[in-house]
Interface confidence: low
């Protein structure tokens, strides 16, 4: 059958940019910095402004090897700090909560489903 | 072997666009990112701005954000820079350039092309 | 953006000599992340494009000569060329290649008397 867009609107092409790319501050050379910044960054806003974390959940910082885990320690975070709950500041409500995955302290929804939620209505 | 050749020499009159092209071949055209350079008679170096032909993303030198245009043709491997409005001060010899064996393997500009002179003048 | 600043502009010498040049950096060039500094030299010989030397900082391009050494950290750079030849007769930029814009040196003129 004939590829439609939606095929290529799947979790797992923006599970694998997110895992290569997101906060990979040790590229070999900075062309590819200038898009992890930009992945980083829009990672950051979407899950910040949705309330989600990662692609599927906070598993994915878990289950996957990313450049999250190589730049971060498993015990210092599990999943980016943008997956906790925040206070109206844009600060963690509480951070030590939130990496322990105490619930109410961080998103457990994925943003896959937030964001396709959408597009699957076009 | 990874080849850039460039296009020819140009002669154009101030404030008529110019359009330079490098053709790359010798490896896969959308696994690393394309660079121009500037050099201003008996002058240093200037880096423009780079592409990614995978998507066309491009990474400018605010210094010619108004100035360059950077785009791709995927399908005849050929990355072009057109400069907008030329005046004297673009009288230069610009190179295109990219990094090493494989897109991810070294820092530096190993394959350059040979450069394409462009002359304004009324 | 970072400014590179080389030193000395030109310098004139004798076959077989030892010399060296200058590159240092408004910020630092070192990524904590891999302990790599993204620094790189070209050489320009007259009438040619530029041939990449030495890439972070101090690794040498393949097929270049071992009389040609990068070294230095964050913001301090030198080019080494152990015994000047006739043949390396060029201008010698170093780049910063950490951050966009890659800015280039003004580069080092080496003459041979």
């Known amino acids: 059958t004939a590829a439609t867009q939606q095929d290529f609107f799947t979790p797992n092409l923006f599970l694998k940019q997110m895992l290569e790319r997101y906060q990979n501050n040790s590229p070999p050379n900075n062309d590819d910095q200038w898009k992890n910044n930009g992945v980083t960054k829009t990672w950051d806003r979407l899950m910040l402004q949705d309330n989600c974390c990662g692609v599927n959940g906070p598993s994915d910082w878990q289950k996957y090897t990313s450049a999250f885990r190589t730049e971060n320690n498993d015990a210092d975070y599990p999943w980016p700090r943008q997956c906790c709950v925040m206070n109206n500041l844009k600060e963690p409500l509480n951070l030590e909560a939130c990496k322990l995955g105490v619930p109410g302290f961080y998103h457990n929804q994925g943003c896959y489903e937030l964001i396709s939620g959408p597009m699957n209505r076009h | 072997q990874v080849q850039l050749q460039q296009s020819g020499p140009q002669l154009v009159r101030p404030g008529a666009s110019v359009k330079i092209s490098c053709k790359a071949s010798g490896y896969s055209f959308t696994t690393s990112w394309m660079h121009w350079m500037k050099q201003r008679p008996g002058q240093g170096l200037e880096w423009i701005g780079m592409i990614d032909p995978s998507d066309s993303e491009t990474g400018l030198n605010q210094i010619f954000r108004d100035k360059a245009t950077l785009t791709v043709d995927k399908y005849s491997s050929t990355a072009y820079m057109q400069l907008s409005s030329p005046t004297s001060e673009d009288s230069a010899v610009y190179y295109c350039a990219r990094r090493g064996r494989f897109s991810y393997d070294y820092g530096g500009f190993a394959y350059w092309g040979q450069g394409t002179l462009v002359t304004v003048s009324a | 953006d970072i400014v590179m600043t080389q030193s000395p502009s030109s310098l004139t010498v004798t076959a077989g000599e030892k010399v060296t040049m200058s590159c240092k950096s408004s910020q630092s060039l070192l990524n904590s992340g891999n302990q790599k500094n993204y620094l790189t030299w070209y050489q320009q010989k007259p009438g040619q494009t530029p041939k990449l030397l030495i890439y972070?900082?101090?690794t040498r391009e393949s097929g270049v000569p071992d009389r040609f050494t990068g070294s230095g950290s964050g913001t301090d750079f030198t080019l080494t060329i152990s015994s000047v030849q006739a043949e390396d007769l060029a201008v010698y930029y170093c780049?910063?290649?950490?951050?966009?814009?890659?800015?280039f040196g003004g580069g080092t003129k080496l003459e041979i008397k």
């Open positions: 972070w900082a101090s």
């Open positions: 780049q910063n290649d950490y951050s966009n814009p890659f800015t």
